[in-house]
């Protein structure tokens, strides 16, 4: 007789979940030898210990500290690059400018990122069919938590210029419900954090408007500034010459305007 | 409140080696990040080394990897920077600290909450 499972409205835990992140956590550790004393078997035990037998409607930010632990790392707190609704270029900039990090550019980000997982309550099974979705299901779950967690300490971590990553072609280019807007812009340190410079980047080749004047963006300097934060933001016009113009900042054509 | 008291330091030849230790008390738990910092006259409180209590975490700073090694024995509370192949730019006044762990470590001396008196490494050539 099989046995009766809940039934959740999101996505099932991502196929292949344990040997992903065993092999993440292999790949990782060699590309940053930094991180060579992590031992990834039990970086994976703790994964699994964070959900595995729990319901996963309620998860707790303790539930992840063992990996955390695990997961301590060195950031270079004035070199933290935030992002919201635009990761793949976020991820595109720091693999040229090495030296800035988004989440992702860590172990535990990079073991999660673009990941689903969960498990089910009281027994060792990972739930493959389906997970909570954070709307229709419950906040908190695995993903959900993991995700609050780390974006909170990553924040906390933030000092001098922080910068962040939005996405112009939204109709929310700063969003109060993202992560960014909902976690991190309330966890930066205003004793350590001088300014927050947003660089807002355009979708249309022919859009020369001033997105820093958005409401949303206007609304995030609000937030910011009743943090005794400053506040900055840069249009960046075209985004590939941008990118183009980090790889080889000395080419002529990126004195003008990006 | 965590006390640390270094020990150790002295003056050494170029090439030579040193052994600080950093004696923690106050503490109820291992959560926490210890670190050694060095001084030189006029310049900047920098990080040489840093270490989870708790964990496998260790970092080095750059001018310090492959001479330098950070260890811990926790049953005496203890923390240890073994220095090796010292250089005259070694010389500095060093300094143990200690803050709550939390997962993303900054290298700066602003982060961490407490620190012993300093004990002095002299290193001529």
């Known amino acids: 007789v099989p046995r009766w499972r809940q039934q959740w409205s999101g996505p099932g835990t991502t196929k292949r979940f344990p040997e992903t992140v065993l092999a993440r956590c292999v790949k990782y550790t060699e590309i940053h030898p930094e991180m060579r004393h992590v031992d990834c078997q039990s970086v994976w035990d703790a994964f699994k210990g964070a959900f595995i037998s729990k319901h996963p409607c309620n998860i707790t930010e303790e539930d992840y500290q063992p990996l955390m632990k695990l997961g301590t790392q060195t950031v270079p707190c004035n070199k933290i690059l935030l992002w919201s609704r635009i990761k793949d270029l976020a991820h595109q900039f720091t693999q040229v400018q090495r030296d800035m990090f988004t989440l992702e550019d860590t172990l535990l980000g990079y073991l999660a990122d673009d990941l689903t997982w969960c498990g089910e309550f009281n027994t060792s099974k990972i739930n493959y069919q389906s997970c909570p979705d954070w709307r229709k299901d419950c906040s908190n779950n695995p993903v959900s938590v993991f995700w609050k967690t780390v974006s909170r300490r990553f924040a906390e971590a933030a000092c001098d210029v922080v910068h962040v990553m939005l996405n112009g072609s939204r109709s929310k280019i700063f969003d109060k419900n993202s992560t960014f807007g909902s976690v991190e812009v309330h966890n930066l340190q205003p004793e350590k954090v001088q300014t927050l410079e947003a660089w807002v980047i355009h979708g249309g080749r022919e859009d020369s408007r001033d997105l820093c004047q958005d409401p949303t963006i206007k609304e995030l300097e609000s937030i910011i500034s009743k943090r005794n934060i400053q506040f900055s933001c840069k249009n960046i016009y075209r985004p590939d010459k941008f990118l183009q113009c980090v790889k080889n900042p000395e080419d002529s054509s990126c004195t003008s305007e990006i | 409140q965590v006390q640390l008291v270094e020990s150790g330091g002295g003056s050494v030849q170029a090439g030579g080696s040193l052994r600080l230790s950093c004696a923690a008390s106050?503490?109820?738990?291992?959560?926490?990040?210890m670190a050694w910092f060095r001084q030189a006259p006029g310049k900047e409180r920098e990080v040489v080394a840093t270490?989870?209590?708790?964990?496998?975490?260790?970092h080095y700073a750059d001018s310090v990897k492959g001479r330098f090694t950070i260890s811990r024995d926790n049953a005496e509370n203890t923390v240890y920077l073994q220095m090796n192949n010292l250089k005259p730019e070694d010389t500095a006044m060093y300094y143990c600290a200690a803050t709550k762990w939390r997962p993303f470590i900054s290298t700066r001396a602003a982060e961490y909450n407490y620190w012993g008196q300093g004990t002095l490494v002299t290193v001529s050539s």
């Open positions: 270490i989870y209590i708790g964990g496998t975490y260790i």
């Open positions: 106050g503490y109820t738990d291992s959560d926490y990040i």
